[in-house]
């Protein structure tokens, strides 16, 4: 029967006895750097290359002995898993192996670079199809490793890597924390993070998505014919790498940006049970496990946004945060986030000829997160819309004026320490959907963006009742590209984007003890793309 | 049910060329590795090489390298063993038989297809 | 290449009376990544084909009377027949599967006393 792995990234149209998807990932290179590998086992012969490449540091210990079976083990079971004829993910993916792990599983930060810029060197010497660089490996936060990451990513290469399997904030460790790698973290058959040993699979704001990561069986180095099952991010990484070389094989033009955005957009949402995250990971971290696309065709119509989540900003009084998207996505709307509640807002601001999400703290606060809802828009014209405090008392309002341009998000910011408790509730005049509203002494920021067919609508849940959460969430065939609360008298922690639901959190009602608090207001903007749409067909 | 069935006796001249043929049904054959073993007569088993039928992949006993070829019609669900110069000594039984990543033992077998070569 | 050695050649047993074959690898087919001796046995009655009778050396494959049982690990196995019966009377062959190419003992001809 199916491994259960395997069952779990497919979607259920594709489900039979065996895992036979529509496209092996044959026109992909998969890179692998990780340990040497037993080439000639049955479920990889033919399918992997071993390059010449090895940089790897000597073993510890004076009695070490070096068994080949050993030394093979852990790379074997990921060229495996990526493109195994039997329990790969890819069957018809080629892979090439670079050694930059001993037989003991460590490396050197050098010996990854210089497997990197072979990488880079084989590429520009003979360039092939879509390449996917798999980085089964995590180290301690290395600028330099992730540098060298986002050029190969500029590049062009698709690089996936382990989150790591220490139990901790995957941005700590490195490649994990490079922006322009997938990082991936491990769940295992009930979708629950892995658990290894005392320590299990690394999460957070830097996780992309997780992927079937433990008690994944593969080949082993130990004889031809072996299998062995192996658990940790490595193998959720490996999956990912093979789903990648899958979608890149259906769509070899795919960008980076796009095949995260795929990658996301069709992976199981909200199926892991947060509660195994520390308390304060839980909203950072994404539930999200990866599969394959219901069809490798025809997702281009469709409008592709993610949620990204900036580095807190610390607790001094002007820190700000900082999100940023992808060079080749549109930052559509930005929304704030502190847990204590004292925040003074965000905004979007240009900073090298790129929109980016600043956040900012407050007096006495623990800090802020800025939340960037980053989206693929070809052909986007956006800019921002900024009205000055108003001190009026209809509160501050600002919209897209110019022709042609939609509403895709509204942000506010304030000077004033501590805003909201005590102010009026400002009511927006309805029938203006393209205009954002906010307190009187607060500057609002509307994203206002123009591309073919844009179009987009205002979505809001207001509850009377003080609650700790609100949310409102777009339909079908509409995408969430804007996030916030509308200004009332609850004392709201923030908003952020779940996929396609809008997220407004208030402080917890039995803390602040008071039930006269006035509404929470969740507003979602959801847009969707007729000209993406059209184009779709035309391509059927 | 699950079976292979193996084409019919032949009896070829030295020199001749041949192609014996098992179809396998009743599973799915391009996710299992079918394996050729010859049986001299009175004598034991011999593993000539195996193919798997998904990527058309073989591994040849060493043995029988250059002295057969097998291939694999996934569309047909059918796995042959080839000769181009057939010898007396290729007189035997031969058996194809099918096995899995998670079961690499030959758990089904064909009913054997009888190859004599005699001038 | 692994050289499976069986013995004895032949045997011969009186019916409802024990069988014993033994065999043995030229290099160990247990393996510590996942604990299992790659070792099977198989019958052939005369003009059939082999039939699958144990595997990972001690599993018996469904529809097996439970009178076959294998034994033993990394180099030397044992096939027992607790009880002979008629229908037993057959060829007998060890194979192992873990490394190329795969081998099988000369086999070893069992029949009634």
């Known amino acids: 029967s199916i491994p259960w792995n395997l069952e779990r990234i497919t979607p259920p149209r594709y489900r039979a006895d065996e895992y036979q998807p529509p496209d092996g990932g044959s026109l992909v290179e998969v890179y692998l750097l990780d340990t040497s590998i037993q080439s000639d086992h049955r479920e990889i012969e033919g399918r992997v290359m071993v390059t010449d490449f090895e940089n790897v540091p000597e073993e510890d210990g004076t009695r070490f002995h070096r068994q080949a079976s050993k030394c093979d083990s852990h790379g074997t079971h990921l060229a495996g898993v990526v493109s195994g004829r039997d329990a790969g993910v890819a069957k018809g993916a080629s892979m090439r192996s670079l050694r930059v792990l001993n037989c003991q599983g460590k490396g050197t930060v050098s010996g990854t670079l210089i497997g990197l810029e072979f990488i880079r060197k084989s590429q520009l010497v003979q360039p092939v199809g879509p390449l996917v660089v798999l980085l089964p490996l995590a180290g301690g936060y290395s600028r330099v490793l992730n540098a060298a990451c986002q050029r190969l990513a500029r590049a062009g290469v698709v690089l996936v890597t382990a989150a790591g399997n220490f139990r901790d904030d995957a941005c700590l460790y490195s490649p994990a924390s490079a922006p322009e790698v997938i990082t991936v973290g491990a769940t295992n058959a009930q979708d629950q993070p892995v658990t290894l040993g005392t320590l299990g699979t690394n999460f957070g704001r830097c996780v992309d998505l997780f992927a079937p990561g433990e008690d994944i069986i593969g080949a082993s180095s130990d004889c031809s014919t072996c299998f062995v099952s192996q658990s940790g991010t490595s193998q959720a990484a490996a999956h990912v790498a093979g789903i990648a070389a899958m979608m890149l094989s259906a769509e070899p033009e795919l960008t980076l940006a796009e095949l995260r955005q795929r990658l996301i957009h069709f992976s199981a949402k909200d199926v892991i049970n947060e509660a195994w995250f520390p308390e304060d990971q839980r909203v950072l971290t994404p539930n999200l496990v990866a599969a394959l696309p219901p069809s490798t065709h025809g997702a281009g119509w469709q409008l592709f946004c993610r949620t990204v989540w900036s580095a807190h900003s610390g607790p001094t009084r002007m820190a700000t945060a900082v999100a940023r998207c992808a060079p080749d996505e549109e930052l559509l709307s930005c929304s704030s986030f502190s847990r204590s509640g004292k925040r003074r807002g965000e905004r979007m601001e240009a900073q090298g000829g790129k929109l980016v999400c600043r956040a900012h703290n407050a007096f006495g606060g623990e800090g802020v997160y800025a939340i960037a809802r980053c989206c693929l828009l070809p052909q986007a014209n956006c800019s921002v819309h900024t009205a000055p405090p108003a001190e009026a008392s209809m509160g501050t309002r600002v919209h897209c004026h110019q022709q042609g341009h939609v509403l895709t998000g509204c942000s506010s910011h304030w000077e004033v320490e501590d805003l909201g408790t005590h102010k009026p509730p400002v009511l927006r005049p309805r029938g203006q959907p393209n205009q954002c509203v906010g307190h009187r002494e607060a500057s609002i920021h509307a994203s206002c963006c123009h591309a073919p067919g844009l179009e987009c609508k205002v979505k809001e849940h207001g509850i009377p009742a003080p609650q700790e959460q609100v949310t409102v969430a777009c339909e079908e065939g509409w995408t969430l590209t804007g996030c916030s609360a509308l200004p009332g008298t609850s004392h709201v922690l923030g908003a952020y984007a779940v996929d396609n639901t809008c997220v407004v959190r208030s402080r917890d009602v039995s803390t602040t003890g008071s039930t006269s608090e006035g509404a929470v207001t969740a507003v979602a903007i959801c847009c969707r793309s007729r000209h993406l749409a059209q184009a779709s067909q035309e391509l059927q | 049910q699950v079976q292979l069935v193996q084409s019919g006796a032949e009896v070829k001249k030295p020199g001749e060329s041949l192609k014996i043929s098992c179809k396998g049904s009743g599973y799915s054959f391009t996710n299992y590795y079918i394996s050729w073993v010859r049986q001299m007569p009175g004598k034991g088993l011999e593993w000539m090489g195996l193919?798997?039928?998904?990527?058309?992949?073989?591994r040849y006993n060493p043995s029988f390298q250059g002295q057969v070829t097998i291939s694999a019609d996934k569309s047909i669900s059918t796995a042959y063993l080839q000769w181009s110069s057939l010898k007396a000594s290729d007189t035997a039984m031969y058996y194809c038989a099918r096995d899995y990543y998670s079961r690499p033992f030959s758990d089904i077998w064909g009913q054997g297809t009888l190859v004599t070569v005699s001038s | 290449d692994i050289v499976m050695t069986q013995s004895p050649d032949s045997l011969a047993v009186s019916l409802g009376e024990r069988a014993t074959i033994n065999c043995r690898s030229s290099?160990?087919?247990?393996?510590?990544?996942?604990?299992?001796?790659?070792l099977a046995w198989y019958q052939q009655k005369p003009g059939q084909p082999p039939k699958l009778l144990i595997y990972?050396?001690?599993t018996r494959e469904s529809g097996v009377p439970d009178r076959f049982s294998g034994s033993g690990s990394g180099t030397d196995f044992t096939l027992t027949i607790s009880s002979l019966q008629a229908e037993d009377v057959a060829v007998y062959y060890c194979?192992?599967?873990?490394?190329?190419?795969?081998?099988f003992g000369q086999g070893t001809k069992v029949e009634i006393k």
């Open positions: 194979q192992q599967y873990s490394s190329f190419p795969i081998t």
């Open positions: 990972w050396a001690s």
């Open positions: 193919i798997y039928p998904g990527d058309s992949y073989t």
């Open positions: 290099q160990s087919v247990l393996y510590s990544s996942n604990n299992k001796n790659y």
